[in-house]
């Protein structure tokens, strides 16, 4: 039930120490001050697709 610290988060989400939880990066453009948004900036968005095979 309770994720360990810095748990691996699914694509499009990032770990929040503040909330002890993986959080959705989609909220970051509107609310950029969330601590998990720092992790979102380092990873490609969930809808990212490779442009080559």
């Amino acid at each position: 039930e309770q994720a360990p610290g810095n748990a691996p988060c699914s694509s499009g989400s990032s770990w929040s120490a503040d909330l002890d939880k993986c959080m959705d990066c989609a909220s970051c453009p509107a609310r950029p001050h969330s601590d998990f948004c720092l992790g979102c900036a380092a990873a490609p968005p969930a809808h990212f697709r490779m442009l080559w095979p």
């Epitope: 039930e1 309770q2 610290g5 120490a17 503040d18 909330l19 002890d20 939880k21 959080m23 959705d24 909220s27 970051c28 509107a30 609310r31 950029p32 001050h33 969330s34 601590d35 948004c37 720092l38």
Partner: antibody, heavy 123, light 111 residues
Framework: QVSLKESGPGILQPSQTLSLTCSFS??????????VSWIRQPSGKGLEWLAH???????RYNPSLKSRLTISKDTSRNQVFLKITSVDTADTATYYC???????????????WGQGTSVTVSS | DIVLTQSPASLAVSLGQRATISCRAS??????????MHWYQQKPGQPPKLLIK???NLESGVPARFSGSGSGTDFILNIHPVEEEDAATYYC?????????FGGGTKLEIK
């Protein structure tokens, strides 16, 4: 306008189960990022965080009390519940619920608190 | 658990002067870009009221005479100039990791 209000039994005996209800308005616990915590304060003493429930029904507990605590919610009725089993006189306190949700910037402060409900454990 | 130690436990400050309250954490509650420390004011018979979030961000509606600073393990709440309505107990709280804990409180009296 956000508001929260706690309710409980007032007085109960040692070894019984304490059941508390937090009824709130002005926000939805189905909103992504939203959560509600329970905090208690013995008379004249400091604050102790007990448990937190998230919009997606994820839960967190204070490890020192985890075996005795159960937090739950009824999103449609705007209520959060806390049960504490096997209460003792040390559980005598004012119990608060507080909202923790995203503000305009994306901070997650414990920004709104209920007035608290007083609980006395006595034989 | 991260233990938060507030000092002093109580203080008396003359009207218009500066009140300084310290909160020391048993381990860092900051990262390179974030500090997870918050301050509350509580008056008798009332719930705590959020004053400052994330070290230095004033909550909406809180007067500008309140300010917060610090990083790592050492944090400060300043009130200047102190007004009569500031008589209360002040608590620090962190959200760096579980469990979220509070300091023991500092009672401010206005002289």
């Amino acid at each position: 306008q956000v508001s929260l209000k706690e309710s409980g039994p007032g007085i109960l005996q040692p070894s019984q189960t304490l059941s508390l209800t937090c009824s709130f308005s002005g926000f939805s616990l189905s909103t992504s990022g939203m959560g509600v915590s329970w905090i208690r304060q013995p008379s004249g003493k400091g604050l102790e965080w007990l448990a937190h429930i998230y919009w997606d029904d994820d839960k967190r507990y204070n490890p020192s009390l985890k075996s005795r605590l159960t937090i739950s919610k009824d999103t449609s009725r705007n209520q959060v519940f806390l049960k504490i089993t096997s209460v003792d006189t040390a559980d005598t306190a004012t119990y608060y619920c507080a909202r923790r949700g995203p503000d305009y910037y994306g901070y997650y402060p414990m920004d709104y608190w209920g007035q608290g409900t007083s609980v006395t454990v006595s034989s | 658990d991260i233990v938060l130690t507030q000092s002093p436990a109580s203080l008396a400050v003359s009207l218009g002067q500066r009140a300084t309250i310290s909160c020391r954490a048993s381990k860092s509650v900051s990262t390179s870009s974030y500090s997870y420390m918050h301050w509350y004011q509580q008056k008798p018979g009332q719930p705590p009221k959020l004053l400052i979030k994330y070290t230095s961000n004033l909550e909406s509606g809180v007067p500008a005479r309140f300010s917060g600073s610090g990083s790592g393990t050492d944090f400060i709440l300043n009130i200047h100039p102190v007004e009569e309505e500031d008589a209360a107990t002040y608590y620090c709280q962190h959200s760096r990791e579980l469990p979220w804990t509070f300091g023991g409180g500092t009672k401010l009296e206005i002289k």
